[in-house]
């Protein structure tokens, strides 16, 4: 297979792509032009990075959830004292229930007042937002395009300043030499066009229909 790819690199016109229906074949076909000069990140490496990023994201989410739980616990411990029942009997517990019910009623009143204020604020915000739209005139939001993000950028976004300290991904990657010829670059470009044409539902549809 490697020999075939080197022959193809020497010929002026690349051979037409064979009709393949299995995704594993597509993968093999996609890697063929790079048998000699490997892509910057291999598929397995990409998968490894994705897995790593997902793990980091998962850890971050778990840490945040843990922090929230801790915060809730701290808030509750300051608001709710532990029940001290030693030496207290039926009479005191009955009275304690009365005291706690009174406290609950008070908190409920406060919550109701706060909710009323929040509702009022939300209404005011909605009114002001509407006024802003009216003043600006109607406008259309630009359609958002998908942006390709490098592994480094993704790590930077996830970890912020810690990205460089925790993992220097580039250290794990093979450096690509810059001695590529124009011809090779052009062929690589053609190959990429082929893959782009095949990617997406339309490309797959054409491939399967042929």
């Amino acid at each position: 297979m490697a020999d075939g790819s080197s022959d193809a690199a020497r010929e002026p016109r690349p051979a037409p792509a064979p009709i393949r229906r299995r995704s594993s074949n597509y993968r093999a076909y996609a890697t063929e032009p790079h048998a000699k000069k490997k892509s910057k990140i291999s598929a397995s490496r990409k998968l490894q990075l994705k897995t790593l990023l997902l793990q980091i994201a998962k850890q971050e989410l778990e840490r945040e959830a843990e922090e929230r739980r801790g915060e809730k616990g701290r808030a509750l411990s300051t608001r709710c004292q532990p029940l001290e029942l030693a030496g207290l009997g039926f009479a005191e517990l009955q009275d304690l229930c009365r005291q706690l019910h009174a406290r609950v009623d008070k908190v409920d009143e406060e919550r109701y007042d706060i909710e009323a204020k929040v509702t009022k604020n939300i209404t005011e915000i909605a009114d002001l937002t509407q006024k802003i739209f009216d003043l600006r005139g109607k406008f259309k939001r630009p359609t958002l395009r998908r942006v390709r993000i490098s592994a480094d950028a993704m790590m930077q976004a996830l970890l912020g300043a810690r990205a460089k300290e925790s993992l220097d991904l580039r250290a794990h990657l093979k450096q690509v030499k810059k001695e590529d010829t124009e011809k090779e670059n052009r062929e690589v470009g053609d190959w990429r066009k082929n893959i782009d044409a095949l990617s997406g539902m339309e490309g797959r549809k054409k491939k399967f229909e042929s």
Epitope: Q81, P82, E84, G89, F90, E92
Partner: antibody, heavy 121, light 107 residues
Framework: EVQMVESGGGLLKPGGSLKLSCAAS????????MSWVRQTPEKRLEWVAT????????YYPDSVKGRFTISRDNAKNTLYLQMLSLRSEDTAMYYC??????????????WGQGSSVTVSS | DIQMTQTSSSLSASLGDRVTISCRAS??????LNWYQQKPDGTIKLLIY???RIHSGVSSRFSGSGSGTDYSLTISNLEQEDIATYFC????????TFDTGTKLELK
């Protein structure tokens, strides 16, 4: 031996304030609720206040609510009763007592010797 | 508030007698009743709790009984050291209340 010693009593005028103390010993103080009970000159016993073991909850009869405050210092094994706006009817012997309970029935199982408070103009 | 009342404020008895002191609550207190003894020097001791349970260190000559609203303290074979004032106290509802006491005297 379980022991309670009250102090801080005295003679004062109506409207005055006073703070009684009760030093407890012979038991794990922080494990028990505590109470103050007074005995009037007519020898009637009146419950005045109760505080939970950790000091979070306190209980009072209407006659002293808002004027008296029970508190405790578990590090010092000491119980306190802060009395404000004293009236002549507050004249009594004030006893400090340890609380315990059995199947919901609470009782004062050990009492101090008492501290005398006289409110008179 | 629950009112506690004793049938008599004082009682005379002879040494060796069996003495019964009664106490009534103004409403049901479901056995949440305690008995205290106050000696002439002012010291107060718990005798009986939860109607019939004898407190540690208290002589078995003391016993308690009752239910609902009516309760009693019995001293069998009265001794000199039993000469004191006896109080009942309900532990059912706050405020905790005592009766006026029954003073036990020798005949």
């Amino acid at each position: 031996e379980v022991q309670m010693v009250e102090s801080g009593g005295g003679l004062l005028k109506p409207g005055g304030s006073l703070k009684l103390s009760c030093a407890a010993s012979g038991f794990t103080y922080s494990n028990y609720a505590m109470s103050w009970v007074r005995q009037t000159p007519e020898k009637r016993l009146e419950w005045v206040a109760t505080i939970s073991s950790g000091g979070s909850y306190s209980y009072y009869p209407d006659s002293v609510k808002g004027r008296f405050t029970i508190s405790r210092d578990n590090a010092k094994n000491t119980l306190y009763l802060q009395m404000l706006s004293l009236r002549s009817e507050d004249t009594a012997m004030y006893y400090c007592a340890r609380r315990d309970n059995y199947f919901g029935s609470s009782f004062m199982d050990y009492w101090g010797q008492g501290s005398s408070v006289t409110v008179s103009s | 508030d629950i009112q506690m009342t004793q049938t008599s404020s004082s009682l005379s008895a002879s040494l060796g007698d069996r003495v019964t002191i009664s106490c009534r609550a103004s409403q049901e207190i479901t056995n949440y009743l305690n008995w205290y003894q106050q000696k002439p020097d002012g010291t107060i001791k718990l005798l009986i709790y939860y109607t019939s349970r004898i407190h540690s260190g208290v002589s078995s000559r003391f016993s308690g009984s009752g239910s609902g609203t009516d309760y009693s303290l019995t001293i069998s074979n009265l001794e000199q050291e039993d000469i004191a004032t006896y109080f009942c106290q309900q532990g059912h509802t706050i405020p905790l209340t005592f009766d006026t006491g029954t003073k036990l005297e020798l005949k």
